[in-house]
């Protein structure tokens, strides 16, 4: 894992932390799939998207993500060196208009319609955890990531570095 | 001020062993990624190892993979490497540096260290 | 693994000149990719990251881009202090690369 030693440790600061421009550094349009090749796909259902973790048939086309990445600088650290971190977050947008969100009393993930500025609620920090995989922790509440849960993505509490690792918060990055 | 201070390099025989330091300071330590890079004399920069700032799964360069060992002490603020079976080809100036983000390796490393050199010869 | 080529490897320029170096990586990085300059018996400084942000405190007359394979940095009016070697490196997946270095020197 990337983290520290106790997730909160650094994760405390995100509440106060600002997105240092409102324009991303970069832009990447991606599939997103589980640790365990899961395809992340989006449905339009009732005029409302659904999000879905499943098995796509073989040469079956996978659902794009604009991943948009800022930086976020938070406030000076507790040991008082006054070094500020600097943090990379994400939106995720499958389609014009539409965020990824946290819902957090529900510990779901859902896709809103929104106008910018996006809301809090729309921004993830980045991990990047083994080689090739990547985590995303609710801006709005710290040590709480988007995962897999019942083949859907859920909103998933993780106490301690070393659980920064389990496979149902590990997501890759595909541009195929 | 961010500081990164490499020392413990020296002369060694080949089939030697070594162990590198970096003492840092200015920043929260257990906050960042850690990465060593060399440069044999009159070459350019070689990326060696990485560790993460809670000092899991560590990577390394294929040239090094089972001689070195990256590690980290959070509570001494200190970067280590050892290494081992030492080869001429390993001769270089090492340089310790920190990543640019906290939780994210993407951004390339911001600080360095003014580096320490090896220098592996019978 | 992923290679990196940078090109020219040595260039010859004057005060006041724009240079341009190119990097290719052998397969995408999307944008993660940085860009150091450094100095004869001096440590690498970071001067762009993610391909086209300027690093904290340096001029403004250094700029990157490009994404994917194909990426450049340009110094639009080269300064004395300038002169130096500039190296490329992919931070997108391990083992991390660098290029093999461009050398700007005084024509």
């Known amino acids: 894992a990337f983290g520290i030693s106790g997730v909160q440790k650094y994760t405390r600061a995100l509440h106060d932390s600002s997105i240092t421009g409102i324009s991303p550094i970069t832009e990447y349009l991606a599939s997103l799939s589980t640790y365990n090749d899961q395809s992340i796909t989006f449905a339009l259902e009732d005029e409302s998207y659904e999000i879905y973790v499943e098995d796509l048939k073989k040469d079956e086309k996978k659902d794009k993500v604009l991943l948009s990445y800022y930086e976020s600088q938070h406030p000076s650290n507790e040991s008082g060196d006054g070094v500020d971190g600097k943090m990379l977050m994400v939106t995720l947008s499958p389609t014009k208009d539409f965020w990824l969100h946290a819902n957090n009393k529900e510990h779901s993930v859902e896709l809103h319609k929104c106008e910018k500025p996006l809301p809090d609620q729309a921004f993830f920090v980045l991990h990047n955890m083994h080689s090739n995989c990547v985590s995303f922790e609710c801006k709005t509440d710290p040590g709480v990531f988007i995962g897999v849960k019942d083949n859907h993505l859920a909103l998933i509490k993780v106490d301690s570095s070393e659980n920064l690792c389990t496979e149902n918060i590990l997501f890759k990055l595909s541009e195929t | 001020e961010v500081q990164l201070v490499e020392s413990g390099g020296g002369l060694v025989q080949p089939g030697g062993s070594l162990r590198l330091s970096c003492a840092a300071s200015?920043?929260?330590?257990?906050?960042?990624?850690l990465t060593w890079v060399r440069q044999a004399p009159g070459k350019g920069l070689e990326w060696v190892s990485f560790?993460?700032?809670?000092?899991?799964?560590?990577f390394y360069a294929d040239s090094v993979k089972g001689r070195f060992t990256i590690s980290r002490d959070n509570s001494k603020n200190m970067l280590y490497l050892q290494m081992n079976s030492l080869r001429a080809e390993d001769t270089a100036i090492y340089y310790c540096?920190?990543?640019?983000?906290?939780?994210?390796?993407?951004?390339?490393?911001?600080?360095w260290g003014q580096g320490t050199l090896v220098t592996v010869s019978s | 693994d992923i290679q990196m080529t940078q090109s020219p490897s040595s260039v010859s320029a004057s005060v006041g000149d724009r240079v341009t170096i190119t990097c290719r990586a052998s397969q995408g990085v999307v944008s993660w990719l940085a860009w150091y300059q450094q100095k004869p018996g001096k440590a690498p400084k970071l001067l762009i990251y993610a391909a086209s942000s300027l690093q904290s405190g340096v001029p403004s007359r250094f700029s990157g881009s490009g994404s994917g394979t194909d990426f450049t940095l340009t110094i639009s009016s080269l300064q004395p202090e300038d002169f130096a070697t500039y190296y490329c490196q992919q931070s997108n997946s391990f083992p991390f690369t660098l290029g093999p270095g461009t050398k700007v020197d005084i024509k």
């Open positions: 540096a920190k990543s640019l983000y906290t939780t994210s390796w993407y951004g390339g490393f911001d600080s």
């Open positions: 560790i993460s700032g809670s000092g899991g799964r560590p």
């Open positions: 200015g920043f929260t330590f257990s906050s960042y990624a």
